[in-house]
């Protein structure tokens, strides 16, 4: 039978409290449950304690009390309680959530980027979020663009959401560059800075370290290194196709080298242990960045014994 949603002691969708206060939040449910917390609330933190107990009539319900001592502005966010996956139930895990604002007059923005702006990758025509969420829902925030320009929320293309920041539904060229969220609290002006950075889809080059046919003895290990070079503001997806792909014979490791001041270098290393005859054939490394696509392949030959 379907479980009733877990119930939180604080009702409604949001709750405002002052920084420095203690947050008490109880979750009551019909099964064992777990907490999901804002990123800045560490489960290992000494400030945080979670106590579990049996509760309800005949102790048949499951209760869990979350206590967060000396709550801070950056603990603002969603606190949710969800059932642990019940194996017999096909239903997605049921949860109850509340957004808690931890208000601090000295810190209107949850995340502050002052000296160095936070980089946000954007794509023209897509939604862009300037994530200057606030610690209290009644803070008035202005969105400014360098130099000396103000972007006005119109409730359609540009929307203000105190839990997210400014949501630009259809980002254009105009939103590329330095954007600043400003808020005045008690006569003090606070700013947090973002740099929207248009991602390109250029793939400069794709190579496999051994492009010539690869000759390998049966039982040996195959290692193929695929390298993709792109401009700095590009991200790629790298995939391999190979003869015994259906049995997931290969293990793939990925890494990115950003030490070069001109380009990003992405590596995808395919490894197959104890090569067999069924592993011979064409190995293809495919690189995709948005609509751009490049691939490179190499043939692998397997031999039973060494030859001269």
């Amino acid at each position: 039978s379907k479980l009733k949603d877990p119930e939180l002691s604080l009702k409604g969708t949001q709750h405002i409290m002052q920084a420095g206060q203690t947050l008490h939040l109880q979750c009551r449910g019909e099964a064992a449950h777990k907490w999901s917390l804002p990123e800045m609330v560490s489960k290992e933190s000494e400030r945080l304690s979670i106590t579990k107990s049996a509760c309800g009539r005949n102790g048949k319900q499951f209760c869990s009390t979350l206590t967060l001592n000396t709550a801070q502005a950056n603990h603002t966010g969603f606190y949710s309680c969800k059932y642990l996956a019940v194996p017999t139930s096909k239903k997605k895990e049921t949860e109850s959530a509340i957004y808690i604002f931890i208000s601090d007059t000295g810190r209107p923005f949850v995340e502050m980027y002052s000296e160095i702006p936070e980089i946000i990758h954007m794509t023209e025509g897509r939604e862009l979020v300037i994530p200057c969420r606030v610690t209290s829902p009644n803070i008035t925030v202005t969105l400014k663009k360098f130099p000396l320009d103000t972007l006005i929320p119109d409730g359609k293309r540009i929307i203000w959401d105190s839990r997210k920041g400014f949501i630009i539904s259809n980002a254009t060229y105009k939103e590329i560059g330095l954007l600043t969220c400003e808020a005045t609290v008690n006569g003090h002006l606070y700013k947090t800075n973002y740099l929207t950075h248009r991602q390109t889809n250029t793939i400069i080059d794709v190579q496999i370290s051994t492009p010539r046919p690869v000759k390998l003895l049966r039982g040996h290990t195959l290692v193929l290194n695929c390298t993709a070079t792109t401009p700095l503001n590009t991200r790629v997806q790298m995939t391999w196709s190979y003869p015994d792909e259906k049995n997931k014979r290969a293990s793939v490791r990925r890494r990115i080298d950003q030490s070069n001041s001109h380009a990003n270098i992405f590596y995808s290393v395919l490894t197959i242990d104890k090569m067999q005859n069924k592993d011979k054939g064409l190995y293809t490394c495919r690189v995709r960045s948005g609509p751009s696509f490049k691939s490179v392949n190499t043939s692998v030959h397997i031999y039973d014994k060494a030859f001269i």
Partner: antibody, heavy 119, light 106 residues
Framework: QGQMQQSGAELVKPGASVKLSCKPS????????ISWLKQKPGQSLEWIAW????????SYNQKFTAKAHVTVDTSSSTAYMQLSSLTTEDSAIYYC????????????WGQGTLVTVSA | QLVLTQSPAIMSASQGEKVTMTCSAS?????MHWYQQKSGTSPKRWIY???KLPSGVPARFSGSGSGTSYSLTISSMEAEDAATYYC?????????FGAGTKLELK
């Protein structure tokens, strides 16, 4: 920490042009605003122009619109400023600087390029 | 364009002494930024957004002000503080700098 490496000193004749370069390192080139500034010996600083490396968009101090032209080359991660129709008044140290924070101040400065205009 | 007037033009202070220099704007500005420049070197960012100290700037430095009147203060002068200090605004285009205050060690 960001650094800005500028090209070496230039001795040029009146009426000629010169192209100065500025190569930032230590941060993603294309996500930066770079300004060019002028300082005559023993004097204060004058802002010439800024350019956003991500798009090539630029803005100039009206005083320098006929004098300076700023560009970027993303393939070599280098910013350039071309000064034309040089006169002795253009003799100065020229700095490139990366913008900080909200863009309205200059966080990292190059070592400067001394341009001397002399017949 | 907006004019910034720095005073005094030249000043000297003994080690340990408190130092204050001012920057006056010809019309109201939102923020003032300050740079330190030593002879033969490029300027360094010293104070931004009126009162914020970038990493690496000693805590004896502070900035304050609003509207048309801003100041930079050193709580206790050190020999390494001898330099020229420039104020800068960008509340209106183009950004402008003050003529500088040269601070010498007495």
């Amino acid at each position: 920490q960001g650094q800005m490496q500028q090209s070496g000193a230039e001795l040029v004749k009146p009426g000629a042009s010169v192209k100065l370069s500025c190569k930032p390192s230590g941060f993603t080139f294309s996500s930066n605003y770079i300004s060019w500034l002028k300082q005559k010996p023993g004097q204060s600083l004058e802002w010439i122009a800024w350019i956003y490396a991500g798009t090539g968009d630029a803005s100039y101090n009206q005083k320098f619109t006929a004098k300076a032209h700023v560009t970027v080359d993303t393939s070599s991660s280098t910013a350039y400023m071309q000064l034309s129709s040089l006169t002795t008044e253009d003799s100065a140290i020229y700095y490139c600087a990366r913008h900080g924070g909200d863009g309205y101040w200059f966080a990292y400065w190059g070592q400067g390029t001394l341009v001397t205009v002399s017949a | 364009q907006l004019v910034l007037t720095q005073s005094p033009a030249i000043m000297s202070a003994s080690q340990g002494e408190k130092v204050t220099m001012t920057c006056s704007a010809s019309s109201s500005v939102s923020y003032m930024h300050w740079y330190q420049q030593k002879s033969g070197t490029s300027p360094k960012r010293w104070i931004y957004d009126t009162s914020k100290l970038p990493s690496g700037v000693p805590a004896r430095f502070s900035g304050s002000g609003s509207g048309t009147s801003y100041s930079l203060t050193i709580s206790s002068m050190e020999a390494e503080d001898a330099a020229t200090y420039y104020c800068q605004q960008w509340s209106s285009n183009p950004p402008t700098f003050g003529a500088g205050t040269k601070l010498e060690l007495k």
